[in-house]
């Protein structure tokens, strides 16, 4: 708390300008009117106030708006935003994408802070869903944003927003998140032709089921090994050697280097060795010739 002291004669601020930068804490508190500050917030960012001075300015705004700042002030907070706590931000009602962009710009270069996370949460909840423009903005500032959401939160992303997603935005997504995103992507890109469709859907394939992988294998897509290694193990296991060969095309040779890693390792264990031998890659660990493979889960279902 800054103690209340009278403003020295001649120091009363008539506007927010650069003459204030050498005001001491108590002088700022005593000589700057909160209402003046609120109407001239856009000027604060053009003046090199120190952190200590920004604390005083924030304190003045807090006193003026105890229930939370109006959006007209929030939009012009600039570097004062870095002084806000999540508790402060929870009092705000931010509806304008321009306001969101302005505040994210201030935080650019920093990792996503609790303040930014709270701001985004307030904004998205206010909008009701993660629309394309919002997603576009958020992933531009924070490529990992999408993967920071829970599967439940991702379920509110409309398929139309998927167009804004870039491959790098999905780098840190886990299988549960891709399970939610993949059907949306499939819907979003459904009207594209084969090769264009594959380019767009590729980064979402970690959520694809077996039947979709089988369908892709018929389309000469030449999936790279990096994508193949991110596929769900349970989706890869039922694929035949011929299907995997068609799916990977010339990249099939890369299986040898990955034979000890999932899902390749588990897939090899499910294939007949003589089928694997047809690839000519020296893959070992398949089911020896002459052995009968019983699918116990199928047997249980029949009984």
């Amino acid at each position: 708390e800054v103690e209340k002291t009278a403003c020295p004669s001649g120091k009363k601020a008539r506007e927010i300008d650069e003459s204030l930068i050498f005001y001491k804490k108590w002088e700022l508190e005593a000589c700057v009117d909160a209402a003046l500050l609120a109407t001239q917030m856009d000027r604060v960012n053009a003046i090199p106030f120190t952190y200590e001075q920004l604390d005083v300015l924030k304190h003045k705004l807090d006193e003026l708006y105890p229930q939370g700042y109006p959006e007209s002030v929030i939009q012009h907070l600039g570097y004062l935003f870095l002084k806000m706590s999540p508790e402060d931000i929870r009092k705000w009602n931010v509806t304008s994408l321009e306001t969101l962009k302005a505040l994210l710009e201030v935080n650019k270069g920093h990792e996503m802070s609790p303040q930014v996370a709270t701001l985004i949460d307030r904004f998205v909840k206010g909008r009701g869903q993660l629309d394309k423009d919002t997603l576009d903005t958020l992933t531009a500032f924070y490529p990992g944003y999408l993967c920071s959401l829970s599967p439940e939160e991702l379920s509110s992303v409309p398929p139309s927003s998927i167009w804004a997603v870039r491959p790098q935005d999905l780098d840190t997504c886990d299988p549960r998140q891709l399970d939610v995103l993949y059907p949306k992507a499939r819907l979003a890109f459904q009207n594209m032709n084969g090769s264009e469709y594959f380019v767009k859907i590729q980064s979402f394939l970690g959520g694809a089921p077996t039947e979709d992988l089988k369908a892709l294998s018929q389309q000469n897509v030449s999936m790279d090994l990096a994508t193949f290694m991110k596929l769900r193990t349970d989706a890869v296991l039922p694929l035949t050697v011929a299907e995997v060969q068609k799916l990977l095309g010339p990249h099939v040779e890369g299986l040898k280097a990955e034979e000890r890693h999932r899902p390749v390792r588990d897939w090899i264990l499910r294939q007949r060795q003589d089928d694997l031998d047809t690839l000519g890659l020296g893959l070992q660990g398949g089911i020896p010739n002459g052995y009968l493979v019983l699918d116990l889960s199928m047997q249980e279902a029949l009984s």
Epitope: E18, S19, I21, F22, N45, A46, I47, P48, T50, Y51, E52, Q53, D55, Y79, L82, V106, H110
Partner: antibody, heavy 120, light 106 residues
Framework: QVQLVESGGGLVKPGGSLRLSCAAS????????MSWIRQAPGKGLEWVSY????????YYADSVKGRFTISRDNAKNSLYLQMNSLRAEDTAVYYC?????????????WGQGTLVTVSS | IQLTQSPSSLSASVGDRVTITCRAS??????LAWYQQKPGKAPKLLIY???SLESGVPSRFSGSGSGTDFTLTISSLQPEDFATYYC?????????FGGGTKVEIK
């Protein structure tokens, strides 16, 4: 890209005067607050003087107050430091420095420095 | 506000983890920057806001701390890292620098 080039340094006798200049390019000079920072031989950095973008707000370290005058000419993209009544302890490399617009109290851009030697 | 850096110099080898500290005479929140200076060159900004890496600075540099005690860490010292490092506070005017820490080759 941003460039700051100092000039005007040299050898001067105690009590003498020098005028340092800093030519700025690669950014909108008139938007930026500018500083002079010095470094005595083998010593640390000292913030000497500071001028606001319009030139109306100025700061001097106590060690140079009353002897040094900072000014700027936004039309010429130039910053100046007039140094009078020079003392041996003013011997230093003088840097002109500018903050990146959004973080105005740290110094992202520095010139190569100009050496001022005060000696009889 | 006075900033005291320690040690004033240190000797280390390539690959070493190096830690430099900066102590402020009073609390400065996270308003601290770190600079690197090589002989005959101007200082170069490495870190601002105590822990935010300036763009283009290698990730082996990191900063931490808040209040009065701050640390600059170089996780694996490289040949080009031998230099003098300075801290600077921007919590209040006048802006001040620490005395510097010289990192030398062992």
């Amino acid at each position: 890209q941003v460039q700051l080039v100092e000039s005007g340094g040299g050898l001067v006798k105690p009590g003498g005067s020098l005028r340092l200049s800093c030519a700025a390019s690669g950014f909108t000079f008139s938007d930026y607050y500018m500083s002079w920072i010095r470094q005595a031989p083998g010593k640390g950095l000292e913030w000497v003087s500071y001028i606001s973008s319009s030139g109306s707000t100025i700061y001097y370290a106590d060690s140079v107050k009353g002897r040094f005058t900072i000014s700027r000419d936004n039309a010429k993209n130039s910053l100046y430091l007039q140094m009078n009544s020079l003392r041996a302890e003013d011997t230093a490399v003088y840097y002109c420095a500018s903050p990146y617009k959004k973080r105005r109290t740290v110094f992202d851009y520095w010139g190569q420095g100009t050496l001022v030697t005060v000696s009889s | 506000i006075q900033l005291t850096q320690s040690p004033s110099s240190l000797s280390a080898s390539v690959g070493d983890r190096v830690t430099i500290t900066c102590r402020a005479s009073q609390g400065i929140s996270s308003a601290l920057a770190w600079y690197q200076q090589k002989p005959g060159k101007a200082p170069k900004l490495l870190i601002y806001d105590a822990s935010s890496l300036e763009s283009g600075v290698p990730s082996r540099f990191s900063g931490s701390g808040s209040g009065t005690d701050f640390t600059l860490t170089i996780s694996s010292l490289q040949p080009e890292d031998f230099a003098t490092y300075y801290c600077q506070q921007f919590n209040s005017y006048p802006l001040t620098f620490g005395g510097g820490t010289k990192v030398e080759i062992k």
